[in-house]
């Protein structure tokens, strides 16, 4: 039996976390993102996150509770996607006692291209998801996962790597995207914002989700991660939002109630196998899909993301949880851990099922739908 | 699989000292979090130490003072310098890789006796 986290067939209503949010304010993370014209007048003024005075010592701010139980992308109110930028600003920034390219961070300089030259790639992640413009493409059947169900033994490495909460995953996770396209699942890890502010990587039509979790899978193509880098398809990241529910989630919790043993940037504690599926939507059947780009350096390409459109719920006190206890680099607390949407240049996001098939009255005028490439060509 | 060459282990005693060495053959090596962790005979493996991507350091608690780990990026090395040795330090002692994927080496012998 799966762990209760969403009733499956609730619309979206008002409530949803960061709803009410300026637009503007969801997308400035604590790095990459440049002004842009619909960010709200002096936006851009703003001090970065480094330069604020702590973020743990602003007063916490409760999301909304969430009424109904599903939100499905598809059905989010209509907004103004944010522009892309032109050039993507992928800003990091070392230690002052290093110059090690791979010291990066969220927030401040040097810009990430100068960490890893692929981070000024034309196809890089994460994006704005915009149901409306995606390609339908039946060919996308539902992802198959098998053997993510852990038993208790052995125990897993759950690591703070001062970036983000990494699950280290034992060898025997397979999932499959479609026929010929098998994966290993390797590790997974979490992406959040701050108390009243949202922090997922990805966005739908501008809005940001409270975090968003990663599996990130090898294809079964390649022995080792270093061969697959930059190769398509050559690394899958299964993604899925996490918002704000009533009641807590019994699969997270397992992995929530040991983050304050491993506060300490570089910690890292033993934890008991669990269902790793039960971290992810229970509808497969229905994602988006495109080729990308890891989020961090160093941003290689060809990574094929599937963005579930179903979310998990947690609780409130999860989500702060979540955002509240971590430290990372330079006694800061760890929050904010997302990259900037980045332009798509071309690229169509596919959709397993007809998401920007709309019959509200929001809907003033017939949409002209991308044409789906078959999965595999 | 990512190669993981651990050499240094040997025979020492107590109050003595030896140095790990662990070369990663991997072009990511920078973005690894690179560890040292032990196995005694009939135990569990367990953490001796790790480094981060930044250097940040982490160290089981029955070895701070008396362990050191370092990298040398240029190198693709890992190291653990271990002094005041103690017989319960008598372990197989394996080399970790970990960013993506998590990579193991084969392990040195470490044995403590006087």
């Known amino acids: 039996q799966r762990l209760p986290r969403m009733q499956e067939d609730s619309p979206l209503g008002g409530g949803s976390s960061g709803e009410d949010d300026p637009l503007g304010e969801e997308d400035l993370p604590s790095e990459e993102d440049s002004p842009r014209e619909e960010d709200p007048p002096g936006e851009e003024d703003l001090p970065g996150e480094e330069d604020l005075p702590g973020e743990e010592d602003l007063p916490e701010v409760k999301p909304k509770s969430e009424e109904e139980g599903s939100l499905k992308l598809e059905d989010l109110p209509t907004v103004e996607a944010p522009g892309d930028p032109q050039e993507p600003q992928n800003n990091a920034h070392r230690d002052k006692e290093g110059d090690d390219q791979s010291h990066w961070r969220y927030g401040g300089d040097p810009p990430w291209p100068r960490v890893s030259p692929a981070c000024a790639g034309r196809f890089q992640s994460p994006v704005d998801i915009r149901p409306q413009l995606a390609a339908f493409c039946p060919a996308l059947r539902p992802l198959e996962l098998l053997g993510f169900q852990l038993p208790p033994l052995p125990e897993l490495r759950l690591r703070n790597n001062g970036h983000s909460v990494q699950l280290t995953l034992p060898p025997g996770l397979e999932m499959a995207l479609g026929p010929g396209r098998e994966y290993r699942a390797l590790q997974l890890h979490l992406h959040w914002g701050a108390a009243g502010r949202p922090g997922s990587e990805h966005t739908v039509e501008g809005h940001r989700f409270p975090a968003e979790i990663h599996v990130v899978h090898l294809s079964t193509a390649f022995a080792r991660v270093d061969e697959a880098l930059g190769r398509p398809g050559g690394l899958a990241v299964l993604a899925a939002f996490l918002e704000e529910g009533p009641e807590e989630n019994s699969a997270y919790e397992q992995l929530l109630s040991r983050l304050e043993e491993i506060a300490e940037e570089g910690s890292e504690t033993q934890v008991p196998g669990l269902d790793i599926s039960a971290l992810l939507p229970s509808d497969f059947s229905r994602y988006f899909q495109y080729e990308g780009s890891l989020t961090t350096p160093p941003c290689a390409q060809g990574v094929i993301w599937t963005v579930f459109n179903q979310t998990v719920m947690l609780s409130a006190k999860q989500l702060h949880t979540l955002s509240d206890t971590l430290w990372g680099p330079g006694d800061s607390r760890l929050q904010l851990n997302f990259r900037a949407t980045q332009p798509l240049n071309g690229r169509v996001i596919e959709a397993s099922f007809p998401a920007g098939v709309d019959s509200s009255p929001r809907a003033a005028e017939p949409v002209q739908l991308n044409s789906c490439l078959a999965a595999g060509d | 699989q990512v190669q993981l060459q651990e050499s240094g282990g040997g025979l020492v005693q107590p109050g003595g000292s030896l140095r790990l060495s662990c070369t990663a053959s991997?072009?990511?090596?920078?973005?690894?979090?690179m560890g040292w962790y032990r196995q005694a005979p009939g135990k569990q493996r367990e953490l001796v130490a790790t480094?981060?991507?930044?250097?940040?350091?982490n160290y089981a608690d029955s070895v701070k003072g008396r362990f050191t780990i370092s990298r040398d990026n240029a190198a693709k090395t890992v190291s653990l310098q271990m002094n005041s040795l103690k017989p319960e330090d008598t372990a197989v002692y394996y080399c970790?890789?970990?960013?993506?994927?998590?990579?193991w080496g084969q392990g040195t012998q470490v044995t403590v006796s006087a």
């Open positions: 970790n890789a970990a960013w993506i994927g998590d990579y």
């Open positions: 991997t072009s990511s090596f920078n973005f690894q979090t």
């Open positions: 480094i981060t991507s930044r250097a940040i350091t």
